[in-house]
């Protein structure tokens, strides 16, 4: 009876448990009842990471200088190439697919801590009488203005993106 | 397409002044919060000054602070470093940066020499 699974590493195909391709490999041919699977090694500037069937490796990532990217870790047929920003500067992403002189902190945050040589902009959310309306690598929080010393009332609260809105008091006739 | 033009740069003894410009085009400078950032001979970048978009905000490295001077005209489309009282170590290629910082929005600097 033809198997409905295929062990750990293996694949079904045309009611046929199948050997993977082990990583660093890709797939030519699938296996028959009187051969093995046959596999190919990777190309130079490809990989596969993992046991698969795939027909095509997958491209080496290109660290592209113009964007600010070098090459931190070379590839190899089984690893994709890992890829960092210049000196002083700092990766968007996880992934490092381009590069930022610092980061700035939204609206709502604050700068903590402006960015050197070696460490990213440090950001921290404004606290509660605080706000920040602006993307900035350099402003920190800013407090709320303080309508009872202008004379005035809070017309509308503040929040940590907008400052409070003072108003003229109401005068009882 | 963002381009940033440093000019202004040059040898100067220590002691003097120089005042650095930044040109921009290509994205609308009166929205942008803009920064100088130097690099001296085989040392790492150094955020110098900055400046919020209203041009009423602004920040000094230590190192910089009550010498040199930021401003803008967002008329003009440019952005300024008055540098006095020059010392040796103030000697670098400055650029100027625009948020959010990009590599490819990065002019190429103008050289300050401060030397005797």
């Known amino acids: 009876e033809p198997p409905t699974a295929c062990r750990e590493k293996q694949y079904l195909i045309n009611s046929q448990c199948c050997s993977l391709c082990q990583p660093g490999q890709k797939l030519v041919s699938d296996c028959t009842e009187f051969t093995e699977t046959e596999c190919l090694p990777c190309g130079e500037s490809e990989f596969l990471d993992t046991w698969n069937r795939e027909t095509h490796c997958h491209q080496h990532k290109y660290c592209d200088p113009n964007l600010g990217l070098r090459v931190q870790q070379k590839g190899t047929s089984e690893t994709d190439t890992i890829c960092t920003c210049e000196e002083g500067w700092h990766c968007t992403s996880e992934a490092c697919e381009s590069c930022v002189l610092h980061r700035s902190c939204s609206p709502g945050f604050g700068v903590k801590q402006i960015a050197t040589g070696v460490s990213d902009t440090i950001c921290e959310p404004c606290p509660v009488g605080f706000f920040s309306n602006v993307s900035s690598a350099f402003e920190k929080c800013h407090p709320w203005t303080s309508c009872e010393t202008k004379d005035l009332v809070v017309q509308q609260a503040g929040t940590n993106k907008t400052d409070v809105v003072c108003g003229p008091q109401d005068r009882l006739r | 397409e963002v381009q940033l033009l440093e000019s202004g740069g040059g040898l100067v003894q220590p002691g003097g002044s120089l005042r650095l410009s930044c040109a921009a085009s290509?994205?609308?400078?009166?929205?942008?919060e803009m920064w100088w950032v130097r690099q001296a001979p085989g040392k790492g970048l150094e955020r110098v000054s900055?400046?919020?978009?209203?041009?009423?905000?602004?920040y000094y490295a230590d190192s910089v602070k009550g010498r040199f001077t930021i401003s803008r005209d967002n008329s003009k489309n440019t952005l300024y470093l008055q540098m006095n009282s020059l010392r040796a170590e103030d000697t670098a290629v400055y650029h100027c940066?625009?948020?959010?910082?990009?590599?490819?929005?990065w002019g190429q600097g103008t050289l300050v020499t401060v030397s005797s």
């Open positions: 290509g994205f609308t400078f009166r929205d942008y």
């Open positions: 940066a625009k948020l959010p910082f990009t590599f490819e929005d």
């Open positions: 900055a400046i919020n978009p209203q041009g009423t905000r602004t």
